[in-house]
């Protein structure tokens, strides 16, 4: 099974404001999986619709 993401490096612990950093394998860049109630590329916005 080929994983589509890796854990982000330690250097990216603050990359996501309210979420978990994942390093996308294909795009070769970090991305954020937002915690419930947050949205945005860096999970920086409260989801007003939540």
């Amino acid at each position: 099974v080929v994983s589509h993401f890796n854990d982000c490096p330690d250097s990216h612990t603050q990359f996501c404001f309210h979420g978990t950093c994942r390093f996308l394998v294909q795009e070769d860049k970090p991305a954020c999986v937002c915690h419930s109630g947050y949205v945005g590329a860096r999970c920086e916005h409260a989801d007003l619709l939540a």
Epitope: D7, P9, D28, A41
Partner: antibody, heavy 116, light 106 residues
Framework: EVQLQQSGAELVRPGASVKLSCTVS????????MHWVKQRPEQGLEWIGR????????KYAPKFQDKATITADTSSNTAYLQFSSLTSEDTAVYYC?????????WGQGTTLTVSS | IQMTQSSSSLSVSLGDRVTITCKAS??????LAWYQQKPGNAPRLLIS???NLKTGVPSRFSGSASGKDYTLNITSLQTEDVATYYC?????????FGGGTKLEIK
């Protein structure tokens, strides 16, 4: 294709300031951190610091904290490295870089010479 | 995180299999790069993620990882491979580099 194009060589006087640039194509600098690395003549490589262009947050190696300022302009997809109060110790080649797990990208380097 | 390249120079012959080692003081989970640098030139990225060969780099170069130990292998040394090689960890900040291993022809 991702490319990092750095500004040209600089010859400056001691005590002066200088601002080096790194313009990125093929990659949105808001998507990851941009870093700067120093290499003095005949020496190894030294990390200066990084910027998160999405919000301007920076992190520096302790020895560069009061010497270097890293900024970014997302509209032009450009990262900058500025130095103040230059001395001969700042004579070096400076590289901008962005590293992924599978790929990495470096600029061609900017030679900074500090001399009176 | 300290990166130690145990040999600052290696005396080699053309055609040799060359192994350059780098040890991390902490786990860096394969966030390691290898560079080749020739005098007067910028560092050339060979490998990222410990094992991923950059496009255009000859297949005689390869990287491997075992715990905190990382290795760059050159299967059959060519004239153009005579250079200084650096490892770098980019797991944590500050990024840190090994001191370099210079290949010299016997």
């Amino acid at each position: 294709e991702v490319q990092l194009q750095q500004s040209g060589a600089e010859l400056v006087r001691p005590g002066a300031s200088v601002k080096l640039s790194c313009t990125v194509s093929g990659f949105n600098i808001k998507d990851d951190y941009m870093h700067w690395v120093k290499q003095r003549p005949e020496q190894g490589l030294e990390w200066i610091g990084r910027i998160d262009p999405a919000n301007g947050h920076t992190k520096y190696a302790p020895k560069f904290q009061d010497k270097a300022t890293i900024t970014a302009d997302t509209s032009s997809n450009t990262a900058y490295l500025q130095f103040s109060s230059l001395t001969s110790e700042d004579t070096a080649v400076y590289y901008c870089t962005r590293m992924g797990l599978r790929r990495g990208y470096w600029g061609q380097g900017t030679t900074l010479t500090v001399s009176s | 995180i300290q990166m130690t390249q145990s040999s600052s120079s290696l005396s080699v012959s053309l055609g040799d299999r060359v192994t350059i080692t780098c040890k991390a003081s902490e786990h860096i989970n394969s966030w390691l790069a290898w560079y080749q640098q020739k005098p007067g030139n910028a560092p050339r990225l060979l490998i990222s993620g410990a094992t991923n060969l950059k496009t255009g780099v000859p297949s005689r170069f390869s990287g491997s990882a075992s715990g905190k130990d990382y290795t760059l292998n050159i299967t059959s040394l060519q004239t153009e491979d005579v250079a200084t090689y650096y490892c770098q960890q980019y797991w944590g900040t500050p990024w840190t580099f090994g001191g370099g291993t210079k290949l010299e022809i016997k």
